[in-house]
């Protein structure tokens, strides 16, 4: 008789997961010095640890905490860069600019980067089937509570200019429903943080208005305002002439507004 | 601008004790939880025991668990850890960091720990 399996609405486990979480922490070991250390082995044992034999919609913050102690990382705080609904762009910007930080450029954010997993109340088996859809099932499921437990944290961590990333092109450029509204904005520490700005990226060649005054924005800034941080705001016209200019700053095209 | 001081340090045998305290100014110490983490010879960065603001929760990392306690003096702005038969294996330069990881921006020059017979 096939045992019974909870239908969830969201996508399954992401193909190979194990696989795939060892093979990136090797790669990020190998490609950042400083985490060479890391015994990757012991770090899939934590991730698995999380949420294997768990009830995929009764996950806490404190089950990510033997894998939080492994992820232990350097990061200055004040080269991070937050990003909502455009994270392509953020990540080629961070290529280009070493010295700044995504939560992704991180190494727990980027064994997760992309990936869904969950598993089953007492057994050990990952779910490849199906996993609880954030709005339909459940909010306390493994990946809304582990990019909520690293994106608060790693809010906190940051101090003085705070930059995000905004997309232009959405209805909603600042949504207080994304990670960065409702977790990242208010984890934000007011003593630390001087100035949350913001880069307001546009889509349309022609698109020459003045996106900083939209009234998302404006409910921004009322938001960063009220918690005592300070709160500047830039249009980035031409995202790729942005990239071209952080890859080459000297150039001469490079002086004018992008 | 936030600023920490570490000291405490030195040269110890093994099964010997030390305690680290912790100087902290430029925030509302009792706002923030603390941590300590140690990097030794040629390793990377490893955490080693948080703590809340309040000081009333605590967490340590499991190789230190049972021989190292993390406390604060909010009145004093003071972080500390007393460590206990300390092992070769302990020998690291140890820093205080606001906030419980795991992402970390120490500002101190930290604190030299060597245990060796």
């Known amino acids: 008789v096939p045992r019974w399996r909870q239908q969830w609405s969201g996508p399954g486990t992401t193909k190979r997961f194990p696989e795939t979480v060892l093979a990136r922490c090797v790669k990020y070991t190998e490609i950042h010095p400083e985490m060479r250390h890391v015994d990757c082995q012991s770090v899939w044992d934590a991730f698995k640890g999380a949420f294997i034999s768990k009830h995929p919609c009764n996950i806490t913050e404190e089950d990510y905490q033997p894998l939080m102690k492994l992820g232990t990382q350097t990061v200055p705080c004040n080269k991070i860069l937050l990003w909502s609904r455009i994270k392509d762009l953020a990540h080629q910007f961070t290529q280009v600019q070493r010295d700044m930080f995504t939560l992704e450029d991180t190494l727990l954010g980027y064994l997760a980067d992309d990936l869904t997993w969950c598993g089953e109340f007492n057994t050990s088996k990952i779910n490849y089937q199906s996993c609880p859809d954030w709005r339909k099932d459940c909010s306390n499921n493994p990946v809304s509570v582990f990019w909520k437990t690293v994106s608060r944290r790693f809010a906190e961590a940051a101090c003085d200019v705070v930059h995000v990333m905004l997309n232009g092109s959405r209805s909603k450029i600042f949504d207080k429903n994304s990670t960065f509204g409702s977790v990242e904005v208010h984890n934000l520490q007011p003593e630390k943080v001087q100035t949350l700005e913001a880069w307001v990226i546009h889509g349309g060649r022609e698109d020459s208005r003045d996106l900083c005054q939209d009234p998302t924005i404006k409910e921004l800034e009322s938001i960063i305002s009220k918690r005592n941080i300070q709160f500047s705001c830039k249009n980035i016209y031409r995202p790729d002439k942005f990239l071209q200019c952080v890859k080459n700053p000297e150039d001469s095209s490079c002086t004018s507004e992008i | 601008e936030v600023q920490v001081l570490e000291s405490g340090g030195g040269l110890v045998q093994p099964g010997e004790s030390l305690r680290l305290s912790c100087a902290v100014s430029g925030f509302t110490f009792s706002n923030f939880a603390m941590s300590w983490v140690r990097q030794a010879p040629g390793k990377g960065l490893e955490w080693v025991s948080g703590i809340s603001g309040s000081g009333g929760s605590t967490d340590y990392a499991d190789s230190v668990k049972g021989r190292f306690t993390i406390s604060r003096d909010n009145s004093k702005n003071t972080l500390y850890l007393q460590m206990n038969s300390l092992r070769a294996e302990d020998t690291a330069l140890y820093y205080c960091?606001?906030?419980?990881?795991?992402?970390?921006?120490?500002r101190g020059q930290g604190t030299l720990v060597t245990v060796s017979s």
């Open positions: 960091a606001d906030g419980t990881g795991p992402f970390f921006d120490y």
